[in-house]
């Protein structure tokens, strides 16, 4: 599942190349292992902003698929309460390119621990 | 064809650079507030084909209290007082419903 999430992220990266989306998105660039589910929640929430602002059906579908995949992968530990983690709104806002790069890194973190 | 002034969003302001069709503008959350993750500050001037009237799209933006400020512990009461001055809580700017800045 996580491997498919990476391929969806690559697809989103390719699709937004031709678009001008100037949004800045809350980005956790240094994820602590004890806060990875909380960080993933922020990435998934902010991914929806890309979908909303692109107005593109392919991006919309890919974002929804990615969220479905991540949700199912996290259904076992999605309700784990991580304490002492930053809320999404406390994170630094970064451009879409940096956001997607950091997103790939956190997914790889999940791949390495699954 | 141009758009009218955009709608108000609670705890946010907007400085419109262009009212022309297809113009994309962003709301900014007021000081002490942050854009809620997953919501978009973007609004676009679009044409309603049925009525031929331009309007701004409704942003999904929600501005919430900055969690960094919410989490801050109040400083312990000071033993030194300044005569004649009563410390006031920092007042937040209006919600955005009361005022808008529309720059042409």
């Amino acid at each position: 599942n996580w491997v498919n999430v990476i391929s969806d992220l690559k697809k989103i990266e390719d699709l937004i190349q031709s678009m001008h989306i100037d949004a800045t998105l809350y980005t956790e660039s240094d994820v602590h292992p004890s806060c990875k589910v909380t960080a993933m929640k922020c990435f998934l929430l902010e991914l929806q902003v890309i979908s909303l602002e692109s107005g593109d059906a392919s991006i919309h579908d890919t974002v929804e698929n990615l969220i479905i995949l991540a949700n199912n992968s996290l259904s076992s530990n999605g309700n784990v309460t991580e304490s002492g983690c930053k809320e999404c709104e406390e994170l630094e806002e970064k451009n879409i390119k940096e956001f997607l790069q950091s997103f790939v890194h956190i997914v790889q973190m999940f791949i390495n621990t699954s | 064809i141009t758009c009218p002034p955009p709608m108000s969003v609670e705890h946010a302001d907007i400085w419109v650079k262009s009212y022309s069709l297809y113009s994309r503008e962003r709301y900014i959350c007021n000081s002490g507030f942050k854009r809620k993750a997953g919501t978009s500050s973007l609004t676009e001037c679009v044409l309603n084909k049925a009525t031929n009237v331009a309007h701004w799209t409704t942003p999904s933006l929600k501005c919430i209290r900055d969690p960094a400020l919410v989490h801050q512990r109040p400083a312990p009461p000071s033993t030194v007082t300044t005569a004649g001055v009563t410390p006031q809580p920092e007042s937040l700017s209006p919600s955005g419903k009361e005022h808008h800045h529309h720059h042409h």
Partner: antibody
């Protein structure tokens, strides 16, 4: 008024195939994900398949995975369900339903067709 | 898979009286983004299902306000404040937070 009309149901032998169609009208078909839901005679509802707006992504429960294929033709405003290797337990009324997007309003099947009956029997 | 369990399976109600249907999921259906995709569908005799409530408590357009949804986590409830004759039918809860999406077994509401 949103309209969804299923067709293609009928009697088929076990191991056989059938293709259901769902004609959509009065809404922009390509803007919505679509689903198939079935109901065995006198029983409850069972989700069968979902397809994304553009048709690139499909989702199935294990009970039909590998046997059923959901697809769509946005130029014809039509949803399909190709059913292969049919079994007696696939006997049901098959409904197509329009699915509201997660990103714009939370998942939900807001409009349903009248259903088409599929009977698998020798 | 998430198993949805409804109770009661049969609910005889007097016209004008309230009715309450419970739906319990085998695990929390709060998704990673904090949303709970829980719907309620009504199926009148001989008809197709119809959406009543989405995301736990949001009434779909055209649904009378005597219908209300509540709950969180694993426990959800559909309430009808005053049952009318047209409310007769089977009510299903449905989760689409996690694939495979699953329905409850249904609760048959009938008039006493």
């Amino acid at each position: 008024e949103v309209q969804l009309v299923e067709s293609g149901g009928g009697l088929v032998q076990p191991g056989g195939s059938l293709r259901l169609s769902c004609a959509a009208s009065e809404f922009t078909f390509s803007n919505y994900a679509m689903s198939w839901v079935r109901q065995a005679p006198g029983k409850g509802l069972e989700w069968v398949a979902t397809i994304s707006r553009g048709g690139d992504y499909t989702y199935y429960p294990d009970s039909v995975k590998g046997r059923f294929t959901i697809s769509r033709d946005n130029s014809k405003n039509t949803l399909y369900l190709q059913m292969n290797s049919l079994r007696a337990e696939d006997t049901a009324v098959y409904y197509c339903a329009r699915r509201v997007s997660m990103i714009t309003g939370g998942w939900a099947m807001d409009y349903w067709g009248q259903g088409t009956l599929v009977t698998v029997s020798s | 898979d998430v198993v949805m369990t409804q109770s009661p399976l049969s609910l005889p109600v007097t016209l004008g009286q309230p009715a309450s249907i419970s739906c319990r999921s085998s695990q929390s259906i709060v998704d990673i983004t904090g949303n709970t995709y829980l719907e309620w569908y009504q199926q009148r005799p001989g008809q197709s299902p119809r959406l009543l409530i989405y995301k736990v408590f949001n009434r779909f357009s055209g649904v009378p306000d005597r219908f209300s949804g509540s709950g969180s986590g694993t426990d959800f409830t559909l309430k009808i404040s005053r049952v009318e004759a047209e409310d007769v039918g089977v009510y299903y809860c449905f989760q689409d937070s996690f694939v495979p999406y699953t329905f409850g077994q249904g609760t048959k509401l009938e008039i006493k």
